[in-house]
Each structure stands twice: as C-alpha cells, then as structure tokens.
Interface confidence: medium
C-alpha cells in the first residue's frame, strides 16, 4: 500500500475496507427511508455536526456519528400528491430535501426544504447549552421558503444568515427557471437580483456565500457568491459554463425609483483555472465545484481555494485554484463589462463611470452616502446595466496547485487545513471525488511560497459504494473530517501516522505534516514537542539527513 | 369557514368565450393548488384542470387542452378560468375546488350553456 | 366512459349496511389514492374519504374506505335517509396525468 512515487501517486491508498479494519472511518450508512445527507453545518461549540437529508435533519456527535439525533420533518400527503401530479418523481422529488441548515441565534437553527416543490422553513431548537440536549422542531412556526430553498432538489442553493437575515442564491419559480440572490427574513423587505435579465445570472448553479469584510467599519461588510452560470452571448463563441464570484454590500437596500427592492451593488467577476496547452490555447477548468475559504490571521483577506472541474464530456480533468481576496477586489475596482448591443463584443467600459461607483457599499470610509436609497439616478442605471466586470480574477501564480487530468473520477468538494510542521505552515487540502474517496494534498512552497508543489498524501475510499461525495467539513477541535453522500456521512480522522510504516525514513518520506518520528514511531507531530526528539521534513521529504543518527 | 364562490357563467354561443372567476376565502389561499371540475347535466363529474400555488404548473384534461387557460391572482384570492372556442359539449356546471391531495372543499358551481 | 368503474345505482334500508365499489387499474387505484365524495340532490360535491380511508373532520364513522389492489370501496352502515345522494370515488391517473373520477353510483334508501 505504501508508495514512494511521482507527486501524482498516492503515498498511501486505502480501501474502504482497509479503512474499517484499521479504525480509520466511522459510518452513517443512511436511513431506509431517507438520503441525500447533502447539507452540513458543523458546530464544534456544541461538538455537533447537523446534516439536512430528505425528510430529515441529523445531528451527530463530532466524536463519533454513530452517536445522532434525529427530527423527521417530511411533507403532508397533501404536498406529496400535489407534487406527484406535477408529473414528479415520488421517491426523488416529491419528499423534503433540506437545503438550508444555519445557525439562527444561540438557540435556534433556521432550515428550509423543497417540501415537495413548495419550499418550507422552520426553526430548530438546540437549546442554550450542549448539555440541554435539546433537538426539536418549532412546529408552530412554519414559514414559505420560496426564495430560501430552491423547489426542485436536483438544484443547487448557496445561503449564508447573518444578524437574523438570509442570503440565498437559489431557484425561486417552479419550472426552475427564476434564478436570483435573495435577502430575506430580517425586518427589511425582501432584496433580489434583477429578474429575467442574463446579463446579472444566466442560468446559475451555486456553490456557496461567505461574509468578507472588507475594512474596519462594518458598514463596508460585502457578501461573496461563488457560482458557475452560462457565458453571456458574445462572451464566448458557443455553449460556455463561467465560474464566478459575485459581491453584494451587506447594507444594500435596493434604490429608490429604480432597482427598488433590487440590489444597487450586485458585480460579478469570472474566476479563470486553467493550464497553458498545445498551440497557446488554454485548457480551462471552467466547472466551478466548490469553494472553501481559508481564514488566516486577517479575516479581511482568507485565501480562496476553488474546485473546478473541465466542460468538456471528451477531456475529463479537475483542478484546484487558490485566489487572493486582494486580487478579486483588483477586478472589482477595474473596468466594467460593456456592449453597445447584442450583437456587439464585450469591451472594457470607458466612458465616465458615475460617482459613488457602482458596487461600493455606502458608509463613511469611501463616500458621503448613507444608504443606497439615496444614491444617484444616474449610479443606478449604470449598476442595473453593468453588473459584470471586464477582467477576470486569475489564480494565485496564474495556475492550479492540483491538476487531475489521468484518472477517472472528478473533484467534487475541498477543505483545507492550515498544520504547523517543523520546518514551517503547510496548507493541507482533502478534497471529495466523485467516486467516494478523499484526497489529501498537501502544497510545498518551492523557491518562493507562491511557487507550489503538490504532494498527494492519501487517497481514500470512505464509503462502501463508489458515490459522490457532496458535503464535507474539517473539525480542527476534533481533528477529523466529516463526508456526506447520497449515501450517508462518514467520519475519518485528518492523520492516520501509523499506518506510514514502521521506521523513521518511511514516515520522513510520506512528507505529511501532521507527522513526525517521534524515537520509535511515526506519530501525531506537536509543535510544543521538543524539537530534538521529533524527525519530520515537509520540504524535501529528506531522510539520510533526518533519520542517520 | 371555507368559501369559493364561482361566477362569470351564462349562456354562449358555439366559438364563443366566457371567464369564469372563484373568490376564495377562510384559508391562506397562496398556499394551495386549485381546480376546476365540472359536471354536465344529469350527468357525472369530470375534472378540467388544476393550478400550482404558486402559477408555477398548470394541466389540463385532454377534452380542454389548448381551449381553456387556468390561472389565479393571489394578491386577490381569486382563481379564472378562461374559455375559448366553447362547444355545446362544454355545457355544464363548473365548480371550483381547493386541492389538498383531493377536492377538499367545492364552491357552489356556476352554470355555463353553450347553445348552437 | 369512466376510466373509473362504479356500478350506476345501489339501495338499502335505514339501519342496513351497503357497500359502493370502484375499480380501476394500476395507473390510478393501484398506485394512488382514493377519494370518495358525496354530493347531495341540488349541491355541490364534499370530500367523504380521502387518501383511501380516512375520514375529514365532521364525517360521520359510518362511513369508512378501503382499498385493495386497483379496487376500493365505500361502505356505509347503519344507513339513514339523509345519505340518499350521488357518490363518486376519483384518484390521480399517472398514465393520463389528470384526475379521474367513476360514473358515479346513485344510492337509495328506501
């Protein structure tokens, strides 16, 4: 099993049954009458992790899952039949698939189901403590989830609840057709994205949404979007998927006498991932699959890790992206996307651009306006008309760190944890397949420490079945990882030390960063540990200078 | 209390059109898909389309299809019923119906002639 | 022609107990539910049973549904003459996508 190899071959692969036989993976292997444990929201205060499935919500104790909770929260037969007469699947359509699963306050979570196409929310009781051991449904509060969660559960909905009020980028029609981001509950009239015009979302998919803030003043806090959507016509010649992050001002209210109850402040900029190929032309991963955001010493500027996958059904490949916050924020600043008419190309806007300009949220730091009510005419006919950025944001070192191209599976999901080695910080990323296994990668700064190399750790199978993994989180409290399927969830640990073999240069070539040689085996690595007494190199993986004495 | 109280039938003639309306009343009428069934004279009940909650999907008996268009006005708790191209088979009672996974609860009907 | 297959009348005497069928096939009785609604002489239809057998508030327990296979029932006892009406049963049809109703069954109390 252990290998010593290229980058690209595994250091270590286990199966599924070698990880049962060597206690390395706990399994939740689903109800009999549910599935879909696509929805996670960890809470290492409590040591939870709440899952939303169909027709239920989950809460499993972080130290072992086998130990849950449980709320069924299915749909009326009432809902049930209406839905099959739809003409929609029973089993696959007509049934409450939890979408959003937040923390609402320190009490309550906020969910929301399709409810067999009529989107539902309600709130969820965890009590004030861990120890109340409280998980119940507030069945006397039920509220219309139309612009929360998305009717159909085959569609994907990114949402983010702050200071009591939900974000969601979601489907909000039937048919699957009204894509927009929403601002709802809150005391505020609900916000959305301009309806029925490509320009601002072109048939999206979303992937997540995250609160960055963006100075010292709350008021200039922005919310980020990472969704991949058609190319606009004249964007790219032929049928094109773009990634995107999209920004929109937390205080954002909508205009005045236009764009009322629209955001003012929505821009959206395409995210490139791609490798120089034959010929110049560029082979891009343009899939944007998931998005994970590392927050490290100033929460102003978390490093951007996204997971792309390729177009094309010919050339099967996927990537990972790293993105500065700094440079996403450059193209914000930059020219905006301009035509003169349908059949025009995309240039870089020249013209005069109003004053405040457009996607700068109102506050004291950058302008004199107090809400986005009170902003100009003619900054609102500007906003409504160019909600996208001319430049795209290119990767940290203008290429991927990861690169998959000569297997057969794709990347699905990442998560990235931040581990101090010996000889320095090393991000390490598990990153979800679509067959089942869990990557770990870990990215060794070369010369300089934008210059990245990848090293592929491990490679492990977490379900019994090949099946696509589409949830994960990282408790760093915990020190594991936890999967969701349609399948189930699984639980495995972030370092499996032992198993690297039983002497000091085979745990100084598996260059993991959780571990060391710690005199008589290979073991968790503590930067508190002495140093003398622990051999562990990430950099060169070197054991002739580590392991001779 | 429930209530759906039809309107807009009357006599017509062969081609013609008629729009049939339902007031709703005493339930959170948003919330709830609703149909219209009708029943000729003397004779059985027979169903003729139904609308999503939301207008987001409509169907229709294969008898109406393409002549009849079903919709509602939530801000107004009220469900229409436009008819076009009507035939003397048409004739009959129309009731309007709230769906709850069956007719739960039926208006009165409105009677709708369509004379040659 | 009803896709839904009711036997046009049936009769009884106060305090009897009759039985109404309806037969269908596995695109409606056999793999949706049934409803059975009453409609009285000059009135509009109410539900009588909904989702094979269970009965809406205000439904008196004499009446009871059941269903087996792609058939099902409504029977009626201690019969008064207040329940002389026209009963149907419907049900979703999944091939037709559309709701169905039976012929209807005339019941008598004599």
């Known amino acids: 099993n252990y290998q010593n190899g290229k980058n690209n071959v595994p250091r270590l692969k286990l199966s599924y049954k070698e990880m049962l036989e060597s206690n390395n993976v706990i399994t939740f292997n689903g109800l009999a009458n549910s599935s879909s444990y696509h929805t996670f929201l960890l809470d290492e205060e409590r040591s939870r992790l709440y899952v939303g499935a169909k027709d239920h919500i989950f809460s499993f104790d972080l130290v072992n899952i086998k130990d849950f909770q449980k709320i069924v929260w299915p749909v009326s037969y009432t809902r049930r039949d209406e839905c099959k007469w739809a003409g929609k699947d029973i089993l696959k359509e007509c049934a409450n698939f939890i979408k959003v699963l937040k923390a609402y306050n320190q009490t309550h979570l906020y969910a929301c189901g399709t409810g067999a196409f009529h989107p539902i929310c309600t709130y969820i009781e965890i009590g004030h403590h861990p120890e109340d051991n409280i998980f119940k449904l507030e069945n006397s509060h039920f509220e219309n989830g139309r612009g929360k969660s998305p009717y159909d559960p085959k569609l994907l909905t990114a949402s983010l609840l702050i200071d009591g009020e939900l974000y969601s980028g979601t489907a909000a029609d039937f048919m699957g057709r009204d894509f927009a981001i929403f601002r709802t509950l809150g005391h505020h009239h609900p916000i959305r994205t301009e309806q029925h015009d490509s320009r601002w979302l072109n048939d999206p998919k979303f992937i997540s949404a995250h609160l960055i803030s963006e100075s010292d003043n709350p008021e200039d806090d922005k919310v980020y979007f990472f969704f991949r959507e058609n190319a606009i016509d004249g964007e790219h010649s032929g049928k094109a998927t773009h990634a995107r992050i999209g920004q929109i001002c937390k205080n954002d209210f909508g205009g005045h006498r236009s764009l009322v109850n629209k955001w003012t402040t929505f821009l959206k900029a395409r995210l490139i991932c791609s490798v120089p190929g034959p010929n110049g032309i560029d082979t891009h991963f343009d899939e944007l699959q998931d998005v994970f955001l590392m927050n490290f010493k100033d929460p102003k500027n978390p490093v951007v890790y996204g997971v792309f996958t390729t177009s094309s059904n010919i050339f099967k490949g996927s990537a990972v992206c790293m993105y500065s916050m700094s440079d996403v924020r450059r193209v914000f600043l930059g020219p905006y996307a301009h035509r003169d008419g349908p059949n025009y190309q995309w240039v870089p806007y020249q013209g005069r651009v109003p004053y405040p300009r457009p996607g700068t949220c109102p506050s004291k730091t950058f302008g004199g306006f107090d809400s986005t009510k009170d902003l100009p005419d003619d900054v609102i006919t500007f906003a409504r008309s160019h909600p996208a950025m001319y430049n795209p944001v290119f990767p940290m070192n203008n290429r991927p760190i990861v690169i998959k191209t000569d297997v057969n599976y794709q990347f699905t999901q990442i998560v990235v944890d931040r581990v101090d080695a010996e000889d320095g910080q090393y991000d390490v990323m598990f990153i979800g397949t679509d067959v089942g296994t869990v990557l770990k990668v870990v990215s060794i700064p070369k010369e300089t420490w934008y210059d990245l190399e990848e090293v592929l750790l491990e490679e492990m199978t977490v379900f019994r079945e090949p099946t696509a993994i589409s949830a994960m989180e990282l408790s760093t409290k915990q020190q594991q990882l936890y999967i969701g399927s349609t399948a189930g969830v699984a639980q495995l640990p972030l370092h499996r030390c032992d198993i690297y073999g039983k002497a000091c240069a085979e745990c100084c070539l598996a260059r993991d960063p959780y571990c060391a040689w710690d005199g008589s085996a290979c073991s968790r690595y503590f930067p508190t540990a002495k140093r003398r007494t622990r051999r562990q190199d990430i950099r060169n993986g070197d054991p002739l200078t580590h392991c001779s004495d | 209390e429930v209530q759906l109280l039809e309107s807009g039938g009357g006599l017509v003639q062969t081609g013609g059109s008629l729009r049939l309306s339902c007031a709703a009343s005493?339930?959170?009428?948003?919330?709830?898909?609703m149909s219209w069934v009708r029943q000729a004279p003397g004779k059985g009940l027979e169903w003729v389309s139904w609308?999503?909650?939301?207008?987001?999907?409509?169907y229709y008996a294969d008898s109406v299809k393409g002549r009849f268009t079903i919709s509602r006005d939530n801000s107004k708790n009220t469900l229409y019923l436009q008819m076009n191209s009507l035939r003397a088979e048409d004739t009959a009672v129309y009731y309007c119906a709230k769906l709850n996974g069956d007719f739960d609860y039926w208006g009165q009907g409105t009677l709708v002639t369509v004379s040659s | 022609q009803s896709v839904l297959t009711q036997p046009p009348s049936a009769s009884g005497t106060p305090g009897q107990r009759v039985t109404i069928s309806c037969s269908g096939s596995s695109s409606n009785i056999g793999n949706n539910d049934v409803s059975w609604y009453q409609q009285l002489p000059g009135t509009a239809p109410k539900l009588l049973i909904y989702?094979?057998?269970h009965r809406p508030s205000g439904v008196p327990d004499r009446f009871s549904g059941s269903k087996s296979g792609t058939s099902a029932s409504l029977a009626i006892s201690g019969l008064r003459s207040e329940d002389e009406a026209d009963y149907y049963c419907g049900a979703w049809d999944s091939s037709l996508s559309g709701y169905v109703f039976g012929g209807g069954t005339k019941l008598t109390v004599l």
């Open positions: 005493g339930f959170t009428f948003s919330d709830y898909a």
């Open positions: 609308i999503y909650y939301d207008s987001g999907s409509k």
């Open positions: 989702a094979d057998s």
